[in-house]
């Protein structure tokens, strides 16, 4: 088969390419190239003929071909145009043509790129840095590296301008990296140089070391402090709102009672124009303290918030021991100790969580105890229960709802009436209600310190009794073995029960009879003729109870296997034969009759009179039910003797 | 631009020959193929054959194979068709046609042949 | 071999008209077809070749379309010298084969 094949495949612009011809047919009268995908004169680039050894430039002829003996078509000097498909119409000398199509791509030698950038020195968590791969180059893909590793995934960097543009949102200190750009396209790939993120952060909130904040007269004071910040930050310190130096270090000696305090150290960069600070109280203690406890979160929100308990102070070298509902720690996933046993963190505190805790300190002659402390939980609203449970009311009587919603602190109650609020109790009242009181009443409850709110909505019919059920069926002429039937019973009612029966009979157990949709369906599975009954629903609630007309199901069914009488096989020559057919469907199946296979009559009877030997042979009754779409024979031998 | 000059119209008898002649000028008569095509009274057209002239190579269609020959005279730039064992139904209008890169594009004025006894 | 059939067999039509001749072949012949135009007493002349492209000299209101084995000559606006008869003709076999011409007329 004639084939072409480009060498290469893709060109760079300005190269050149050869479109290869193989299995070039014997015998040729002459060949011809054209651009595009099938022999189209307007776009011929040259035809040669094999006897003449001419070349004839056609309209789509630039001057940069060059066409060989064996059809091969050199293009030298590619240009982007040149993209696409090219045809050889080859003429055999017996005039039979033939054709084959060969294509190539077109790309441009990539330039080294660059990475220019809208923000040299961004600040943390404000600014956003958009890198951009220059030159734009058509046809080209543009990937990035992070420290010569592929992007990584994150909702912060985003690709666009056909991923030429590498954007950062909201910068953070580990975008703090090199970066560069290559372009690709099939015949050249290209790397730029790379480029630092410098990301200006910080200070971060400075941290005061060591964590110790309990000391004993005579010891020396020597605290540290350190913010994490670029540039780095310049330190001062604070001892009890006094200016003391500007050093990362504040060393005091000797200290006594009177060096107590709280001591504030505050880091700040110039280039960002941010301040932080860190505050540590410092007690100097001339003897062992009674210990407390602190927290880290007053008022914790339930199922949301953790709370750290700290026994204070902190003292080196000392046991700390803990106490919930004046029972020492029960083992939980929830309850965390710090390795030194002085923080006690409950993780997604629960109502159950209040307390009272105790911390202890055990010295050498005894264990002192903290006053014991509760937890605040905040909790709620949970979703609110409206009572009574009745939701069908007589016309005349009072209505009266209460609405409850576990809360801390408690719910603000709220009711309204089909969207339009009515009042913010707890309880709602009506008295002498009508029908028209009918609607949905909902109760939404709110907890102003937690900011949530759950609302349960209750359905309130007032009527003086239950309308008649009826039953709709989803097939009105199920086919036995075949099909399925729900039956349902209208309408939908609420607080109500729903009963059927089965020829006045409550429903026989029956693994094809399935209720479900809170009995309000009842579902036939496989339907069989014996299915064909009367069927009734009911519905009941405490006000009143009705019940629907019959539905009778009607089943298509059949023909069964016939049965031909009188069952007599043998007959004396001169009788009559009598045969009737007969075969159980719904609705009554076609009757036919063949003898020996010769079709006869359309009847459930056939009749013949005075039979002689000639009528012996095969009788066959066919039956056919055009609705269930089902077809039944059977074949009878007669034999007439002489 | 091309031009096909045909021989003049023939009567000829049932059985006997006929050569139609075809001179090309105006083009280079060899980077092409010469093909003849009849028209019969009623009918359509119908390709008998063609042949290359720088090579000689000649094809016929199935149905003329053994009564035609088709030949070429380079020197003189001239094509022939001989159609032989004649009968009435081969009574029609004989065209030379150039074949190129795309099939017919130049055509002769038409030889009558006329077969009678 | 492969057929051509060309419809209308015939057709009337008035100068300005736009025309439609439709050509069909027995089996796909690529875009090897070509559309002749003849008048009595002359011999064809190359109207269209390679389906849709149009023989140097003839007008710009005779286009080709088609590929496979359906094809199309339109004449945008019908002028007095077009009336003649028309042919296709396959060269995608060295049998070639013509369509048997649809006659346009003035109505």
């Known amino acids: 088969k004639l084939t072409i094949e480009s060498t290469p495949f893709n060109v760079a612009e300005g190269k050149e390419v050869l479109l290869l011809v193989h299995n070039l047919p014997q015998h040729l009268f002459g060949y011809s190239w054209y651009k595009g995908e099938r022999v189209d004169g307007n776009r011929q680039i040259i035809g040669y003929v094999i006897g003449t050894q001419q070349a004839t430039p056609g309209p789509a002829y630039s001057g940069r071909e060059i066409i060989y003996p064996n059809a091969s078509l050199l293009i030298q000097n590619i240009i982007q145009n040149d993209t696409g498909f090219y045809t050889l119409h080859v003429i055999k000398s017996d005039l039979v043509n033939e054709e084959a199509t060969g294509q190539f791509r077109v790309y441009p030698e990539l330039p080294k790129p660059s990475i220019s950038s809208n923000n040299s020195k961004p600040v943390e968590d404000k600014d956003a840095v958009a890198f951009t791969c220059e030159p734009e180059t058509q046809d080209a893909t543009y990937l990035w590296w992070v420290n010569n590793q592929s992007l990584p995934v994150s909702p912060r960097l985003q690709l666009s301008n056909g991923n030429r543009t590498l954007t950062l949102f909201n910068v953070t200190r580990n975008d703090t990296a090199s970066y560069k750009c290559e372009t690709q396209n099939p015949v050249s790939a290209r790397r730029s140089d790379s480029v630092i993120l410098n990301v200006l952060y910080g200070p971060d909130a400075p941290t005061i070391s060591p964590l110790n904040t309990s000391y004993r007269s005579g010891e020396n004071l020597n605290l540290s402090c350190h913010a994490a910040s670029n540039p780095p930050a310049q330190y001062s310190w604070f001892v009890n709102g006094t200016f003391q130096q500007s050093t990362q270090e504040l060393f005091i000696p000797n200290i006594t009672v009177n060096n107590s305090g709280s001591y504030t150290c505050q880091a700040h960069n110039s280039d960002t124009g941010l301040n932080r600070t860190t505050v540590t109280t410092i007690t100097v203690y001339a003897e062992p303290p009674k210990p407390f406890i602190t927290s880290n979160n007053s008022n914790p929100v339930e199922d949301e918030d953790a709370v750290a308990l700290t026994c204070e102070p902190e003292i080196q070298n000392t046991t700390y021991l803990w106490w919930v509902n004046n029972q020492s720690l029960p083992v939980s996933p929830r309850l965390q100790l710090s390795n030194d046993n002085r923080t006690l963190t409950l993780l997604s505190v629960t109502r159950n969580d209040v307390g009272p805790y105790e911390c202890g300190i055990q010295n050498e002659l005894s264990v002192d105890h903290s006053d014991p402390v509760i937890l605040n939980v905040l909790y709620g609203p949970d979703d609110p229960t409206i009572s009574p449970s009745y939701t069908y009311y007589r016309p005349g009587v009072n209505l009266s709802l209460s609405c409850h919603a576990a809360s801390n602190p408690p719910a603000q109650y709220s009711w309204l009436i089909d969207g339009n609020i009515q009042q913010h109790t707890q309880e709602l009242f009506i008295s002498n209600i009508t029908e028209k009181n009918s609607g949905l009443y909902t109760c939404q409850a709110n907890n102003s310190a937690s900011g949530h709110s759950r609302t349960t909505v209750k359905t309130i019919t007032v009527s003086a009794e239950l309308p008649k059920p009826s039953i709709s069926s989803n097939n009105s002429k199920p086919v036995e073995d075949k099909d399925a039937v729900a039956f349902t019973c209208e309408p939908e009612a609420q607080n109500t029960t729903y009963l059927w029966w089965v020829n006045g009979q409550s429903l026989p157990v029956s693994p094809r009879l399935q209720l479900s949709n809170g009995n309000r369906t009842l579902t036939l599975f496989n339907v069989t003729r014996n299915d064909a009954r009367a069927y009734v629903c009911g519905i009941q609630n405490s006000v009143s109870a009705n019940r629907s007309d019959p539905v009778t199901l009607d089943v298509l069914y059949g023909p069964d296997t016939p049965i031909i009488s009188p069952p007599d096989s043998s007959y004396l020559s001169g009788a009559n034969l009598n045969l009737s057919c007969h075969s159980a469907s719904n609705p009554s199946p076609q009757y036919s009759w063949r003898i020996n296979g010769i079709p006869q009559q359309h009847t459930q009877v056939l009749f013949i009179a005075k039979i002689t030997p000639n009528n012996n042979g095969t009788y066959a009754c066919f039956v056919s039910n055009l609705a269930t779409g089902r077809n039944n024979s059977i074949v009878k031998s007669i034999t007439v003797s002489a | 631009q091309v031009q096909l000059v045909q021989s003049g119209a023939e009567v000829k008898k049932p059985g006997s020959s006929v050569k139609v002649s075809c001179k090309a000028s105006?083009?280079?008569?060899?980077?092409?193929?010469i093909s003849w095509v009849r028209e019969a009274p009623g009918q359509g057209l119908e390709w008998m054959g063609h042949?290359?002239?720088?090579?000689?190579?000649?094809g016929y269609a199935q149905k003329f194979q053994g009564r035609v020959t088709i030949t070429a005279d380079e020197s003189t730039s001239t094509a022939y068709m001989e159609l032989s064992s004649l009968r009435s139904e081969d009574t029609a209008v004989y065209y030379c046609?150039?074949?190129?890169?795309?099939?017919?594009?130049?055509w002769g004025q038409g030889t009558l042949v006329t077969v009678s006894s | 071999d492969i057929q051509m059939t060309q419809s209308p067999s015939s057709l009337s039509a008035s100068v300005g008209d736009r025309v439609t001749i439709t050509c069909r072949a027995s089996?796909?012949?690529?875009?090897?077809l070509n559309w002749y135009q003849r008048k009595p007493g002359k011999a064809p002349k190359l109207l269209i070749y390679?389906?849709?492209s149009l023989q140097s000299g003839v007008p710009s209101r005779f286009s080709g379309s088609g590929s496979g084995t359906d094809f199309t000559l339109t004449i945008s606006s019908l002028q007095p010298e077009d009336f003649a008869t028309y042919y296709c003709?396959?060269?995608?076999?060295?049998?070639?084969?013509f369509g048997q011409g649809t006659k346009l007329e003035i109505k």
């Open positions: 042949i290359i002239p720088i090579d000689g190579t000649a």
């Open positions: 089996q796909s012949i690529s875009s090897y």
């Open positions: 390679a389906a849709s």
């Open positions: 046609a150039r074949y190129r890169f795309y099939g017919i594009d130049y």
């Open positions: 105006g083009g280079t008569f060899h980077d092409g193929a």
């Open positions: 003709q396959q060269w995608r076999s060295h049998l070639f084969t």
